[in-house]
Amino acid sequence: SIPWNLERITPPRYRADEYQPPDGGSLVEVYLLDTSIQSDHREIEGRVMVTDFENVPEEDGTRFHRQASKCDSHGTHLAGVVSGRDAGVAKGASMRSLRVLNCQGKGTVSGTLIGLEFIRKSQLVQPVGPLVVLLPLAGGYSRVLNAACQRLARAGVVLVTAAGNFRDDACLYSPASAPEVITVGATNAQDQPVTLGTLGTNFGRCVDLFAPGEDIIGASSYCSTCFVSQSGTSQAAAHVAGIAAMMLSAEPELTLAELRQRLIHFSAKDVINEAWFPEDQRVLTPNLVAALPPSTHGAGWQLFCRTVWSAHSGPTRMATAVARCAPDEELLSCSSFSRSGKRRGERMEAQGGKLVCRAHNAFGGEGVYAIARCCLLPQANCSVHTAPPAEASMGTRVHCHQQGHVLTGCSSHWEVEDLGTHKPPVLRPRGQPNQCVGHREASIHASCCHAPGLECKVKEHGIPAPQEQVTVACEEGWTLTGCSALPGTSHVLGAYAVDNTCVVRSRDVSTTGSTSEGAVTAVAICCRSRHLAQASQELQ
Amino acid sequence: QEDEDGDYEELVLALRSEEDGLAEAPEHGTTATFHRCAKDPWRLPGTYVVVLKEETHLSQSERTARRLQAQAARRGYLTKILHVFHGLLPGFLVKMSGDLLELALKLPHVDYIEEDSSVFAQ
């Protein structure tokens, strides 16, 4: 029978034994930085080339015996998960192993850096097809390890790493915290986050997605035909490395940004039981379990977007938080969120020639998050139009006035400490959907984009307050680019996109004791690209 | 590792040379910073990654490493360059006393220095 984990990553509507992957990963080389491996294991024999790279610290303790089977255990298992004959994800992928972890599974940041440098030099000496680098390891936050990963990613290499097995915020670990790296948490057969002994999978905004990581049967170094169960975020990362290899083999020109967006797009959504995560991390942690695409064609026409959360701003009066998109993504909208509700909104601003999303804390606030909506929009020309606070009581409004530009997102930013106490509330006039509106005390920022065939529409959903959460989703074929709340209530904590749904959160009125005026209204901007659809049809 | 930790007889107590003129002052207003692992048991004091500014060439990295060795030797400290980085990040890996960090942070081209730390199979 097919192992549960391979069944789980098979696209819906297929059985794992019926699914014919578009390609087994044969055009892709996967580098594994790990322990030594047993390359003559039946699962991986002829599939893994052991490089001469080795940089490991001495084993601790006097009683430690270097048994080959023990030294090879972790790496052999992962090589099997990526490309094993029977239990592997990408059965056609070829692998190269570098030894950066000793027999106890311990390495150093410096040894890992030298390993990454070795890969870069190999890539320069003998350029091959797409490269995937699997880093099934974690240490404390390291500026230099993250920087090296960034450089390698910008050289066109896809890096996949383990989120870590510490039941903690993945942002406190490296390389998990490097934004350019695809960071993978672990789930089990029940789609629960994995408990690992006394700890468990890491979580939080630095995790990109989850994948099977409990009771994963793979090659055992105990003998050349043995199998064993291992569990952890390394196993989860190995699944994603295998999926990435298959996607890249089918579409070798995919950029890292395109690959990441596809991994997110084809993931199973909202299947993880979030109660396992600490309460303050639930909204930040992606509810995504990796899966293979049903087919490679038909993905190209999609307008892909993802949500990127900033780090927490901290509680000081003037604190801000910044969320950034990857270099080849467009920032199409910007929103903010504060658990206390005390915030001064958000704005899109240029930084180093690129738009970023900045959220502003307010006096007495516990801090804010900035939330960027990052999309793949080829040949896009996007700009931000700002309207300063209005003099008139009608409120502030701004629209996209350039020919061919469409509204993709609305942001508002204000200097007054508690906007809700300033009346009157402003509601947007009907029949003018292509504009952003806000309180008269707020600056309003419209994200306006021109791209071939891009069209957008506004969807609203309002519910009479008090209401803790209001959502509005884009329909099939449309992608959520913008998510905001209509002005009119003082209780809004913020707005953010979850997959294709805009979520507006309000204060729990039972705890604040006050009652809200008006309704809580979530506003979604839904876009699609006819140009991408046409290009995709021409390819087929 | 390229050089075993115990090979102190290979360490050269560098003589004063043209490398050991006064350190070029770092660019005005940009102070190099020091970083170390927040998890104490994972720290590996005594080994440091010296990261140089982005456009630094290999020859400058080697020169900076030699300058550090020379200045350390003048103060009676042994140092050992374990690896010179190029291709991804400019810089070098050095085995030295933590007492030399202040000196190293003042070297030309230095962006930041990070104490080595452990990573673990997950």
């Epitope: 029978s1 023990k70 255990s73 972790h74 298992h77 106890q104 599974g105 311990k106 097995n165 510490f166 408990t195 690992l196 002994g197 006394t198 700890l199 409990e214 009771d215 049967i217 055992s220 105990y222 003998c223 035909t225 043995c226 199998f227 064993v228 169960s229 291992q230 569990s231 952890g232 390394s234 | 048991p41 994972w42 452990s118 673990f120 199979a121 997950q122």
Partner: antibody
Amino acid sequence: QLNLQQSGPGLVNPSQTLSLTCAISGGSVSSNSAAWNWIRQSPSRGLEWLGRIYSRSKWYHDYAVSVKGRITINPDTSKNQFFLQLNSVTPEDTAVYYCARDWETIIWGDDGPNYYNYGLDVWGQGTTVTVSS
Amino acid sequence: DIQMTQSPSSLSASVGDRVTITCRASQGIRNDLGWYQQKPGKAPKRLIYGASSLQSGVPSRFSGSGSGTEFTLTISSLQPEDFATYYCLQHNNYLWTFGQGTKVEIK
């Protein structure tokens, strides 16, 4: 979904051999992470773990001290089931007998590799066995 | 053998009550402990594994805590369907042992 179905006689004569079968569906007796257990429950003894069998490139057994020497647990890979045999039974062996699965895995962290066992998660329906002539 | 001492052996409680059951191991067992619920004529059903992790599908009113030698099962607000017998199981070594059980009855 793993399911364990028990079968076997409800009455055994003293000094005879008690034989029970546990059929596995939705899993494999040869699994590289599972172990297959027998447990019994009686008013006098409460819940008592008897033993387990598991495959890790070869077959291994662990038996409770209280029944060691009288107990045998064996697999049948062709039928995907496992058996309990308890020899020389006495009325003291009257109990409800359960089969159950546990499973273990290797987990890595900053202290290296550790075997971790997840305990008994799936149980059979139980078989009441009376030892009496 | 590791001995597991469970207390109390029985307790009476009302719907809505907070109930706490304790298991003490004769030696340290890390967090290698599970909690089981058994109703008359049925097989035991696992509620908690790894001392504190909730089994999938089990209501969140059940929680487990402890490590080493002292372990606790808590039912935050007792429901009518929770009246049953509860057992702990240690699986730290290869010879496993159960607690003697706690019967939770309606007051």
